[in-house]
């Protein structure tokens, strides 16, 4: 672990569990990028005062990275060559291949609200296709 603790959304929340989950996750939505390029996956938790203890990034239930309030970032060994932490609680994917196409999830572990999940669909396009503007619209 690099022990650089990130700037966490959510303050030092307290209180008991079973609360109403008022928060919402805003994401970059559906995005596309060129093969060989890079892309930033971003989520933002808003409308809650819950304390964020950890954010997990997953691709089809496979863990990519963890950002922990105490420990900072951990990148899964199988992705460490192509995944970079940040900016913020986001994740940067590098050297994209068509196999990176799919759904990505940011999972916010919070107290007392519990887990919030945001989803982003990434399509990795061949360079020639990307140049001709066949892109998803960001909502």
């Amino acid at each position: 672990y690099p022990y650089d603790v990130p700037d966490y959304a959510g303050g030092g929340g307290s209180g008991g569990g079973g609360s109403m989950m008022t928060g919402t996750i805003e994401t970059t939505g559906n995005i596309s990028a060129e093969k060989g390029g890079s892309i930033i996956l971003q989520c933002h938790l808003s409308s809650t005062t819950a304390q964020v203890t950890q954010v997990n990034w997953e691709q089809q239930d496979q863990l990519l990275a963890i950002c922990n309030a105490d420990l900072g970032w951990h990148i899964s060994p199988s992705f460490k060559d192509r995944v970079a932490p940040g900016p913020g609680l986001g994740l940067t994917l590098q050297s994209l291949t068509v196999n990176d196409t799919g759904e990505y999830a940011c999972i916010y572990h919070t107290y007392p609200d519990g887990t919030y999940t945001g989803r982003i669909f990434l399509e990795v396009l061949e360079s020639s296709v990307a140049e001709h503007g066949a892109r998803f619209q960001i909502p």
């Epitope: 672990y1 304390q51 203890t53 922990n68 107290y111």
Partner: antibody, heavy 119, light 107 residues
Framework: EVQLVESGGGLVQPGGSLRLSCAAS????????MHWVRQAPGKGLEWVAF????????YYADTVKGRFTISRDNAKNSLYLQMNSLRAEDTAVYYC????????????WGQGTMVTVSS | DIQMTQSPSSLSASVGDRVTITCRAS??????LAWYQQKPGKAPKLLIY???TLQSGVPSRFSGSGSGTDFTLTISSLQPEDFATYYC?????????FGGGTKVEIK
């Protein structure tokens, strides 16, 4: 090999205090959140408290809030549970358990230490 | 708090049987459910987490499924060492809560 060994249990009178310890070995203790879970005789499991790896997040079950205090000493690879104002209903086997790095459940448990609250 | 209800509370089965245990949450917990096995006088052992992910070292005859409020633990072919009590536990929000347990006994 991951090992968690609890100690400090025993017989105590209602209103008394006890301090449980959990000695961890076989992993980098300072990287993992830790829990205390208890089990009353012949009953099911009840989560008691959690402390994050660096102690920035501490949570308690409502049944023990204000009476129990969870703490840790990463330099000593140790987890603690200070139990005050003990009641008969606190009688149970107390387990310490490690939280998975991804925060998805408790992957290793100690063998437990028995706490009996009785006059 | 989220209530976890397990059924049945006990069952009798024979070696080689397929066994299914269900767990229902009082509100949606997404995929965040774990299953534990406990033998008398021993600590619980993690079998499944996040609904369906097998913990390292756990035999593949154990499997988990479900999401939202309804979950299932299946033992495809019961072995002698599988006779124990099984607990479900939600790890979606604090306080983490457990089901009442299902005791699997020898028929």
């Amino acid at each position: 090999e991951v090992q968690l060994v609890e100690s400090g249990g025993g017989l105590v009178q209602p209103g008394g205090s006890l301090r449980l310890s959990c000695a961890a070995s076989g992993f980098t203790f300072s990287n993992f959140g830790m829990h205390w879970v208890r089990q009353a005789p012949g009953k099911g499991l009840e989560w008691v408290a959690f402390i994050s790896s660096g102690s920035s997040s501490i949570y308690y079950a409502d049944t023990v809030k204000g009476r129990f205090t969870i703490s840790r000493d990463n330099a000593k690879n140790s987890l603690y549970l200070q139990m005050n104002s003990l009641r008969a209903e606190d009688t149970a086997v107390y387990y310490c358990a490690r939280m998975r790095l991804d925060y998805y459940a408790m992957d290793y448990w100690g063998q437990g230490t028995m706490v009996t609250v009785s006059s | 708090d989220i209530q976890m209800t397990q059924s049945p509370s006990s069952l009798s089965a024979s070696v080689g049987d397929r066994v299914t245990i269900t767990c229902r949450a009082s509100k949606s917990i997404s995929k965040y459910l774990a299953w534990y096995q406990q033998k008398p006088g021993k600590a619980p052992k993690l079998l499944i987490y996040s609904g369906s992910t097998l913990q390292s070292g756990v035999p593949s005859r154990f499997s988990g499924s479900g999401s939202g409020t309804d979950f299932t633990l299946t033992i495809s072919s019961l072995q002698p060492e599988d006779f124990a009590t099984y607990y479900c536990q939600q790890h979606n929000e604090y306080p983490w809560t457990f089901g009442g347990g299902t005791k699997v006994e020898i028929k």
